[in-house]
């Protein structure tokens, strides 16, 4: 790849289905805008979870996504995904694109583990 | 002498903090005395969880202990730790020694990685 | 799908201004740097200029500096490329090309004469 | 500036055949470890089609039978069996950082023979 991402292995979702990890990128140039994307593997096919373009003056992405949000600081993404089920457990990868100025740089991380457990409902109170 | 013993790569716990994961050794060998251990490893060091002795007719093992239930059957442990808690996360080694006849075999797994998480207490009720 | 679709090309009097659009669809358009290319006929490949994904930056090739303007909407997923000073050697399909190059319009022709 | 000269500027070829295009910088793209060349297929009143980026790695969706290769200023494509499909004109392109351009190539037209 022609930047190096790196990311957690492994990330436990909160007993609320929050998951928070970092996306880090080497080396991470002079760029402006930098798109970063959230994808989950599920056998042999991913598929997007989210995706923004940060820049130096818009730092907090994801805004058009519920389930995910992000702050942006130099090379370093702090992801949150929230929402998560049990069923939600997976391999989620971070991509990274040096967006602009060029030359265009992309990178993927190995991906994060995260796992998530459904918590016991409370019982009904009388 | 060795023998081959698997055990799941990651196992969650529920929220109850109940991890259940099947030990199985090869070759399996014809074996009165199986003693099975669960070890847990903290850095560079391991603690011995529960340990117990499966027989042809004690098929019910680790009554000494409160966190540890199993069961044997053939050349299979299924193994259930309870109580746990999120400072319990960590990897679960299970040791297999074919005790009686002779000759010895001893196996150990890789380990299972139990991961934990807390519940969110309830909210009280009025 | 991804669908880029240049318009506003056509006949243009030498000396006059053209401004074309590049009409994005099929991606989230605000996420990508997007380039002006444009081919005379019967010619090679020509690159014009990038704007980033907020339209916060551009970079133009040296020839076009001070002559070009690219511009975008995101609102609107709308790029624009305006030329001025218009001369018969800025006859030409002009493209409009998903940053890196990976997707690509059809075309839009601009023929300057008199 | 850096120029692109590529080789032949029109060859004639037969399905089956294998076919290399060169491309020759006047001076290395190569950049942070990368070269910045990519390779274009276009066929007459179609925009151009990426085949390979980075010198060597395959745009999605390309066949296998395209392939790239070379680093600083010596590039070359190839199209290993020749398709009656692959009849086009090819072009390449290279990123130079200084100043921030890209610049194409002349074009390689592959006819049938």
């Known amino acids: 790849e022609a930047i190096q991402v790196t990311q957690p292995s492994v990330v436990l979702a909160s007993s609320h289905g929050v998951a928070s990890f970092p996306c880090e990128y080497s080396p991470s140039h002079n760029t402006d805008e930098v798109r970063v994307t959230v994808l989950r593997q599920t056998n042999d096919q991913m598929t997007e979870v989210c995706a923004t373009t940060f820049t130096e003056k818009n730092t907090v992405g994801f805004l058009d996504y519920p389930f995910c949000s992000g702050t942006f600081n130099e090379s370093r993404v702090n992801l949150t995904i929230q929402g998560l089920r049990a069923v939600d457990t997976g391999l989620y990868l971070c991509k990274v694109e040096l967006m602009y100025p060029p030359p265009y740089f992309v990178g993927m991380g190995n991906g994060t583990q995260i796992y998530v457990i459904d918590p016991e409902p409370c019982p009904d109170s009388d | 002498e060795a023998i081959q013993v698997t055990q799941p790569s990651v196992v969650l716990a529920s929220s109850h903090g109940v991890a259940s994961f099947p030990c199985e050794y090869s070759p399996s060998h014809n074996t009165d005395e199986v003693r099975v251990t669960v070890l847990r490893q903290t850095n560079d060091q391991m603690t011995e969880v529960c340990a117990t002795t499966f027989t042809e007719k004690n098929t019910v093992g680790f009554l000494d202990y409160p966190f540890c239930s199993g069961t044997f059957n053939e050349s299979r442990v299924n193994l259930t730790i309870q109580g746990l808690r999120a400072v319990d996360t960590g990897l679960y080694l299970c040791k297999v020694e074919l005790m009686y006849p002779p000759p010895y075999f001893v196996g150990m797994g890789n380990g299972t990685q139990i991961y934990v998480i807390d519940p969110e207490p309830c909210p009280d009720s009025d | 799908e991804v669908q880029l679709v240049e318009s506003g090309g056509g006949l243009v009097q030498p000396g006059g201004s053209l401004r074309l659009s590049c009409a994005a669809s099929?991606?989230?358009?605000?996420?990508?740097?997007i380039h002006w290319v444009r081919q005379a006929p019967g010619k090679g490949l020509e690159w014009i200029g990038i704007i980033s994904p907020s339209g916060g930056g551009t970079k133009y090739a040296q020839k076009f500096q001070g002559r070009v303007t690219i511009s975008r909407d995101n609102s609107k997923n709308t790029l624009y490329l305006q030329l001025n000073s218009l001369r018969a050697e800025d006859t030409a399909v002009y493209y409009c090309?998903?940053?890196?190059?990976?997707?690509w319009g059809q075309g839009t022709l601009v023929t300057v004469s008199s | 500036d850096i120029q692109l000269t590529q080789s032949p500027s029109s060859l004639s070829a037969s399905v089956g055949d294998r076919v290399t295009i060169t491309c020759r910088a006047s001076q290395s793209v190569d950049f942070y470890g990368i070269s910045f060349l990519d390779w274009y297929q276009q066929k007459p009143g179609k925009a151009p089609k990426l085949l390979i980026y980075d010198a060597s790695n395959r745009a999605t969706g390309i066949p296998s039978r395209f392939s790239g290769s070379g680093s600083g200023t010596d590039f070359t494509l190839t199209i290993s069996s020749l398709q009656p499909e692959d009849f086009a004109t090819y072009y390449c392109q290279q990123y130079v950082s200084s100043p921030p351009e890209y610049t194409f190539g002349q074009g390689t037209k592959v006819e049938i023979k």
């Open positions: 099929g991606f989230t358009f605000s996420g990508y740097a």
């Open positions: 090309a998903r940053h890196p190059f990976a997707y």
